[in-house]
């Protein structure tokens, strides 16, 4: 399917109000740093050259693909050295190894300020004023934040945040309206980043067949009606998406995505009985409603999976012909049998059967050898249903700000390296998911729990890797992306590490905490937490606990004083003493 | 070694009611469906109704709106509810419990609709 110009092709393919967000999405990925008037202006002359190709496919330069006519563009950014140093380098090289060069230079945790919601009033003149500017700048702010963002998802957030606008600038309490709104688009965003940027590393770090065996397990567990040859056509092209994504070809990965979208509508008799009301929504909306569609039904007589498995004679012969169709029609099989297990675990148990063939089918009996196959798996399948019964347990008991207080203890104790503001963010996402995944029914619980704890943890992975200062973290996000979860589960008190010097500094608070919001008062306790452990490893629960309520009380007890800052200047002193007495 | 029980069959009138249990014994973990089976004299062996661990429900056409299943998963137990019984569901009735490793059947249950 190959065009004379890509350009073209594209544009025409996306519309030209796809095609602008894409490219300003692409370009603000790239250069994190750079002001939004500088990439709308590269965007408008990409799109002015776009249309010219569009005219005459013919045209100078619209032969050229789209990494080197982007690659060249950003290369014109006149600050590109005195602001990203080494990045420009990249503009050295020839393609494709100039695209690779941009790509290692994302920064999943760029120094950019957090964004500040201005007062509605002023969001909505804004909007009225220039709605165009107002959305592309959602779009550039948001990704530039998040280099990773799933494109074609990023520009459906935009049009829900165009939508949410539209409709509460009329409102006649515009506040009450929009502020619910853009707190659940935030949440939702920060969740769909994070997603996507696992994605992209499984792809990245393990490989395209890492990837494929992710998808084969959760669409089997999305369509169990599907028929293998199905959901393998279906994985395909999903990977093709999001390798695409993940690579910077945002063009081709939204087009490529609407295409799998026609496809999936086209053919929901043999995928699933869940898509109907998906497939009547316009494009950005159904493409986020088939990745989120429910799971349908399973099929009400599957039968046991021993006979194809375990008890025929040609399961040697079977996996020997094609080792990674067999072992991808195991995992489709027994995703579609097990909903209530996590995808990871799922990956588990395939890694666990590729490898008792690989010893057995090479023994004198090989039957023999692999008849108990699956009684092996019992332990495998036990262990996270047990973590996840213990902590919904320890969640309910203690709610989620102190769930995810012995979280930071659990956290910190296990890995005292990593910088306290990475282990204050990876903590309290790993306590919410107490409140996404207890409340849920049992069959679903370990599913959200488990994959949840993976989008996380790859978060440290991705921090860890720009700045790397523990090998127990190193080896966990490296060895296998499957058992990254119980590697950190399983990791004890460091015993090696030195404690922290005790700096006073740390412990030491002004007024301005009265005026904190309840989140910021949170994360600045949970900071001096870790700060605490970090000091004494060896501190018990009941000391933490001790301090943290003292630090409560203290805090408390200035922010109502008349003269705070004097209170925390006289009580300040006070609490840290008593604190390393505590602790001693 | 599992061993599934059932209990709970007898005789009953056109109309009236039974309610079914079967309660596994021995180790089974990872259970994905559980399912009622019947067998009439001189018949194959039909599926009545089963639940998957999705908590799906399935009935064959001619119980439909008359029986329920339910399962309780924490006893390993599951429970075939049977309304208005006409002389036609006349049969012994098994459990099957599965897991991907075995599909595991009790010894049956007579179940007799008659005036």
């Known amino acids: 399917d190959t065009h004379k110009s890509e350009v073209a092709h594209r544009f025409k393919d996306l519309g030209e109000e796809h095609f602008k967000g894409l490219v300003l999405v692409a370009f603000s990925q790239y250069l994190q740093q750079c002001p939004f008037e500088e990439h709308v202006k590269l965007v408008n002359e990409v799109t002015e050259f776009a249309k010219t190709c569009v005219a005459d496919e013919s045209a100078e330069n619209c032969d050229k693909s789209l990494h080197t006519l982007f690659g060249d563009k950003l290369c014109t950014v006149a600050t590109l050295r005195e602001t990203y140093g080494e990045m420009a380098d990249c503009c050295a090289k020839q393609e494709p190894e100039r695209n690779e060069c941009f790509l290692q230079h994302k920064d999943d945790n760029p120094n950019l300020p957090p964004l500040v919601r201005p007062e509605v009033d002023v969001m909505c003149t804004a909007f009225h004023d220039n709605e165009a500017t107002f959305l592309k700048k959602y779009l550039y702010e948001v990704a530039r934040r998040h280099p990773y963002f799933y494109a074609p998802e990023l520009l459906f957030f935009a049009a829900r945040y165009k939508a949410a606008f539209a409709e509460c600038c009329q409102a006649a309490d515009k506040a009450a309206c929009l502020l619910p709104k853009l707190d659940e688009l935030r949440d939702e965003g920060k969740a769909s980043s994070a997603k996507q940027r696992l994605k992209c590393a499984s792809l990245q770090k393990f490989g395209d067949r890492a990837f494929k065996a992710w998808a084969v397990a959760r669409l089997s567990q999305k369509f169990p009606k599907a028929e293998f040859a199905e959901v393998s056509k279906l994985v395909t092209d999903l990977t093709k998406v999001h390798t695409e994504c993940c690579h910077g070809d945002l063009l081709e990965c939204a087009d490529d995505r609407a295409d799998l979208a026609k496809y999936m509508c086209e053919n929901q008799d043999s995928i699933s009985s869940k898509l109907k009301e998906c497939c009547d929504k316009p494009l950005l909306e159904k493409s986020h409603c088939l990745a989120e569609v429910e799971n349908d039904e399973m099929p009400a007589d599957l039968p046991s999976l021993a006979a194809d498995y375990v008890e025929s004679k040609d399961v040697c012969k079977n996996y020997a012909e094609a080792k990674d169709v067999f072992l991808g029609m195991f995992l489709y099989e027994y995703a579609r049998r097990h909903p209530d297990y996590s995808v990871m675990l799922l990956l588990r148990l395939a890694k666990a059967y590729e490898a008792t063939l690989e010893k057995c089918c090479a023994a004198a009996d090989p039957h023999e050898c692999y008849a108990k196959v699956f009684d092996e798996f019992q332990p495998l399948v036990e262990e996270p249903q047990n973590l996840v019964k213990q902590n919904c347990e320890l969640f309910e008991q203690l709610g989620e700000y102190k769930f995810q207080n012995a979280l930071l203890v659990r956290y910190t104790k296990k890995v005292p390296q990593v910088s306290t503001p990475t282990l204050v963010e990876v903590s309290r996402n790993l306590g919410k998911v107490g409140a996404k995944c207890c409340k849920l029914p049992e069959a679903k619980r370990m599913p959200c729990a488990e994959d949840y704890l993976s989008v996380v943890l790859n978060r440290l992975c991705v921090l860890h890797e720009k700045t790397p200062v523990s090998e127990k973290v190193t080896k966990c996000c490296t060895e296998s992306l499957v058992n990254r979860r119980p590697c950190f589960s399983a990791l004890e008190l460091d015993e090696a590490y030195v404690p922290k010097a005790f700096n006073a500094e740390t412990f030491t608070f002004h007024a301005d905490m009265c005026t904190l919001s309840e989140k910021e008062k949170q994360v600045k306790k949970q900071t001096a937490l870790v700060e605490l452990v970090k000091h004494k490893p060896k501190a018990t629960k009941e000391q933490l606990k001790g301090v943290m309520d003292n630090f409560a009380a203290f805090v408390e007890k200035c922010c109502k004083a008349d003269d705070k800052e004097a209170c925390f200047a006289e009580e300040g002193p006070k609490f840290v003493a008593a604190s390393q007495a505590a602790l001693a | 070694q599992v061993q599934l029980q059932e209990s709970g069959g007898g005789l009953v009138q056109p109309g009236g009611s039974l309610r079914l249990s079967c309660v596994a014994s021995?180790?089974?973990?990872?259970?994905?469906?559980m399912g009622w089976y019947r067998q009439a004299p001189g018949k194959q062996r039909e599926l009545v109704a089963s639940i998957t661990v999705d908590g799906s429900t399935h009935y064959a056409d001619t119980v439909k709106g008359r029986f329920t299943i339910s399962k309780d998963n924490a006893a390993n137990m599951v429970y075939l509810q049977m309304n208005a019984l006409e002389p036609e569901d006349t049969a012994v009735y098994y459990c099957d419990i599965r897991n991907v490793g075995g599909d595991y059947w009790g010894q049956g249950t007579q179940v007799t609709v008659s005036s």
């Open positions: 021995g180790s089974i973990w990872g259970i994905y469906h």
